[in-house]
């Protein structure tokens, strides 16, 4: 299709080389059309649409994204060619930063239902650069935490080194929806609730003598509870002896509850202890079996191919640790009688 009629938008993504970071492009179809798709209509009823209404569908995934190769080749379907780019409804998610993401991205409706729809498309020219500004060493992270029940703020990473006074007007989105009341480089939250969690996007306009473009940053906001003050507790095994059958395989499970920690480095290990020595056993990786806001339950199993007499002389010790401290639970195997 002819993309010469598409509206054009220029965006800049300046990524930090020292942190993981995502980016998004919204399918900014002309205003009336957009409402049929992504429900992010910014028009008030009094505003007059620039284009005739697009007779679109209400299916939120009815948008097709393409990339325009720089060599003039035909448009490429994003879903087929770029595994690190994911389409979610009307939003294109870039999972990894890198200058190779630079290029022209085009979105348009999948279904063309009227003659007016042919030009219903948007071309986004994305420039991606690594951050070089060393003066702003403490720029806001692209992952920010809000403590539930307290006051907090979400800072726009690309503007966090500027004072509120010199900051340009910022457009904020949360999970793809416009936050019309927010215009500064920082969103202040009077009391944090779990619904404040999500993907926030901050945009501001930068210009030079030739053109203007939108500078965009994406912030993943997580609502958290305060760090635990407790060491982990072992939920299983509870008993310090376990009845077993000789010659049969055996799995002993260690389940431990770890309280929330912002920097979470849980340790869960199995040791064997006999009369002379203690050593760590090579066992399958630990797995999280339940995760809530306040805590996480992690399980790690020790597997014996078959229980031998030797195993009855040993203690099997589960060791768990967080930043506060550690807990152990030992199990002695006992032969089942009868």
């Amino acid at each position: 299709f002819n993309i010469s009629g598409c509206s054009t938008k220029k965006l800049l993504w300046t990524y930090s080389t020292r942190s993981e970071e995502e980016f998004v492009l919204f399918c900014d179809l002309p205003e009336p059309q957009k409402s049929h798709f992504c429900h992010r209509n910014r028009l008030s009823p009094k505003q007059v649409p620039e284009h005739l209404p697009f007779m679109g569908s209400n299916d939120l995934s009815d948008v097709q994204w393409y990339q325009q190769p720089s060599n003039g080749d035909p448009l490429e379907d994003i879903r087929k060619s770029y595994p690190h780019i994911i389409q979610d409804k009307c939003t294109l998610h870039f999972l990894t930063p890198g200058v190779n993401n630079s290029g022209s991205y085009i979105c348009r409706p999948k279904m063309i239902k009227s003659p007016y729809d042919v030009a219903c498309c948007v071309k986004m020219i994305l420039e991606v650069k690594p951050q070089t500004n060393a003066s702003c060493e403490y720029s806001a992270s692209h992952k920010q935490d809000l403590l539930l029940g307290s006051t907090g703020s979400i800072s726009c990473p690309s503007l966090s080194c500027q004072s509120d006074a010199q900051s340009p007007a910022v457009t904020w989105y949360k999970n793809g929806k416009l936050l019309s009341v927010e215009r500064s480089n920082r969103i202040v939250v009077d009391e944090v609730y779990d619904y404040h969690q999500g993907t926030y996007v901050c945009d501001y306009t930068q210009s030079d003598t030739v053109s203007s473009w939108t500078v965009r940053a994406v912030v993943q906001v997580r609502t958290i509870v305060g760090d635990t003050k407790l060491k982990p507790d072992i939920l299983d095994p509870v008993e310090d002896t376990l009845e077993v059958e000789l010659g049969k395989p055996l799995t002993i499970s260690c389940k431990a509850r770890f309280g929330f920690e912002r920097v979470f480095n849980p340790v869960i290990k199995w040791y064997i202890k006999d009369s002379d020595l203690e050593w760590e056993v090579s066992v399958p990786e630990a797995k999280s079996i339940k995760s809530t806001l306040k805590d996480e339950i992690i399980e790690r199993n020790i597997i014996l191919e078959k229980v031998t007499q030797r195993d009855l002389r040993r203690k099997f010790v589960c060791f768990v640790q967080n930043s506060i401290g550690n807990t152990t639970q030992s199990v002695q195997l006992k032969e089942k009688r009868g």
Partner: antibody, heavy 115, light 109 residues
Framework: SVEESGGRLVTPGTPLTLTCTVS????????MTWVRQAPGKGLEWIGI?????ATAYASWAKGRFTISKTSTTVDLKITTPTTEDTATYFC?????????????WGPGTLVTVSS | AFELTQTPSSVSAAVGGTVTINCQAS??????LAWYQQKPGQPPKLLIY???TLASGVSSRFKGSGSGTEYTLTISDLGCADAATYYC???????????FGGGTEVVVK
Amino acid sequence: SVEESGGRLVTPGTPLTLTCTVSGFSLTTYAMTWVRQAPGKGLEWIGIISNSGATAYASWAKGRFTISKTSTTVDLKITTPTTEDTATYFCARGRSGGWDALDPWGPGTLVTVSS
Amino acid sequence: AFELTQTPSSVSAAVGGTVTINCQASEDIENYLAWYQQKPGQPPKLLIYSASTLASGVSSRFKGSGSGTEYTLTISDLGCADAATYYCQSYYDGAVTFTFGGGTEVVVK
């Protein structure tokens, strides 16, 4: 790989430390064992250090030897050598973190205790 | 005290022949037994562990068998390169049973 060093001629009573340097695996995964062999004699187990850093010794070796480790080395200290300690000292990796068969072995280092 | 007795102390056989080395434990060691080969001036090399499992890269001419207190290493189709001293080792239960047999010298004629 595993390689011993530090073997030399010492006089009786002079403490000596042998070092086993490992590469290609982690001492937090595997146990390390010291074995010695007097000239023309069989293999004699001295002691073990587990992946967690715990140690155990043959009954005859207790008090005469001390095993310790860093992230890439395992030391064997002969506290008060006697002429009976003249031997080639081998360090070997266990197949697991505790008691197990030994593989691979280092080439050995010769200790001669003589006045 | 736990003992691991290896017999014979020396054995001689012709090229292409078979030798059998025995290792007797003073108590049941539940197959926690290894066999090593040592050539003059070299460190021991693991041949077999868990009584019968061949170590990586070892020829299938070496065969370990046995259970309880009696274990055997059989070397078939002897070659000149098999001339060495062979040791059994128990790793059953702690320091008491972590020990080597006295060794068997194999001479190939």
